[in-house]
Interface confidence: low
């Protein structure tokens, strides 16, 4: 299996890209998966080309996720959906921060008490029903090199 | 560069005890584990779990368990060598995973817009069997 390596996703200049990134989520073992058509969901398949995502560092803990693929920009909207868009707005931003247990979470930078999550299902997980604790919330930052 | 050397994983019987060690080279002013450290497991088919964790995030030198290993395992470390530790007792055939240690450590802060990077050993791998 891909190992993860050197997670600490945001720990460049902003403006400059790491290698691409799978994000496995604790919750189900699902790859966060942004589609070209704005959808985000999440799959088991790592070969999955839609799960090779580049985070950007904006300013110190704060990150945006594209994907490489899609080159669509991972969004949480005022009604708590997660989807991606074309162009980076205020709500593609998210504080990247280190849990007690060495996952990442990535919550919303405008909708603060909010996070990226991914259910059981492989669906994303509305922001509104997410929260700290929470196996949804939890992803480790994975190769996407091989 | 930062590498991490995992030993101390092999066959061990149900109910024994094994003790893994993560050994860290190519660090800076021996910073890499002062800012915590963890270990993972991955066995065959599954997903990777956390088992262990300590000194991570803002929990200063806190320690994380799983609830699969609370009671069985115990993770610790030796700035001085730059080593983390896991002592596995009470070992279950279900223990049975590759091992991987990962540690946290700051990147110069004049290159860190997020300051903690993460660094993943080659894993070692536990075999609980009779």
């Known amino acids: 299996p891909a190992l993860p390596e050197d997670g600490g996703s945001g720990a460049f200049p902003p403006g400059h890209f790491k290698d691409p990134k799978r994000l496995y989520c604790k919750n189900g073992g699902f790859f966060l998966r942004i589609h070209p058509d704005g959808r985000v969901d999440g799959v088991r398949e790592k070969s999955d080309p839609h799960i090779k995502l580049q985070l950007q560092a904006e300013e110190r803990g704060v990150v945006s996720i594209k994907g490489v693929c899609a080159n669509r920009y991972l969004a949480m909207k005022e009604d708590g959906r997660l989807l991606a868009s074309k162009c980076v707005t205020d709500e593609c931003f998210f504080f990247e921060r280190l849990e007690s247990n060495n996952y990442n979470t990535y919550r919303s930078r405008k909708y603060t008490s909010w996070y990226v999550a991914l259910k059981r299902t492989g669906q994303y997980k509305l922001g509104s029903k997410t929260g700290p604790g929470q196996k949804a919330i939890l992803f480790l930052p994975m190769s996407a090199k091989s | 560069q930062v590498q991490l050397v995992e030993s101390g994983g092999g066959l061990v019987q149900p109910g024994g005890s094994l003790r893994l060690s993560c050994a860290a080279s190519g660090t800076e002013d021996g910073r890499l584990l002062t800012l915590g450290g963890s270990w993972f497991r991955q066995a065959p088919g599954q997903g990777l779990e956390a088992v262990a964790a300590i000194g991570a995030g803002d929990r200063g030198g806190a320690t994380y368990y799983a609830d699969s290993v609370k009671g069985r395992f115990t993770i610790s470390r030796d700035n001085s060598k730059n080593t983390l530790y896991l002592q596995m007792n009470s070992l279950r055939a279900e223990d049975t995973a590759v091992y991987y240690c990962?540690?946290?450590?700051?990147?110069?802060?004049?290159?860190?817009?997020?300051?903690?990077?993460?660094?993943w050993g080659q894993g070692t791998l536990v075999t609980v069997s009779s």
């Open positions: 990962t540690a946290l450590y700051e990147r110069q802060p004049q290159l860190a817009a997020t300051k903690v990077a993460r660094k």
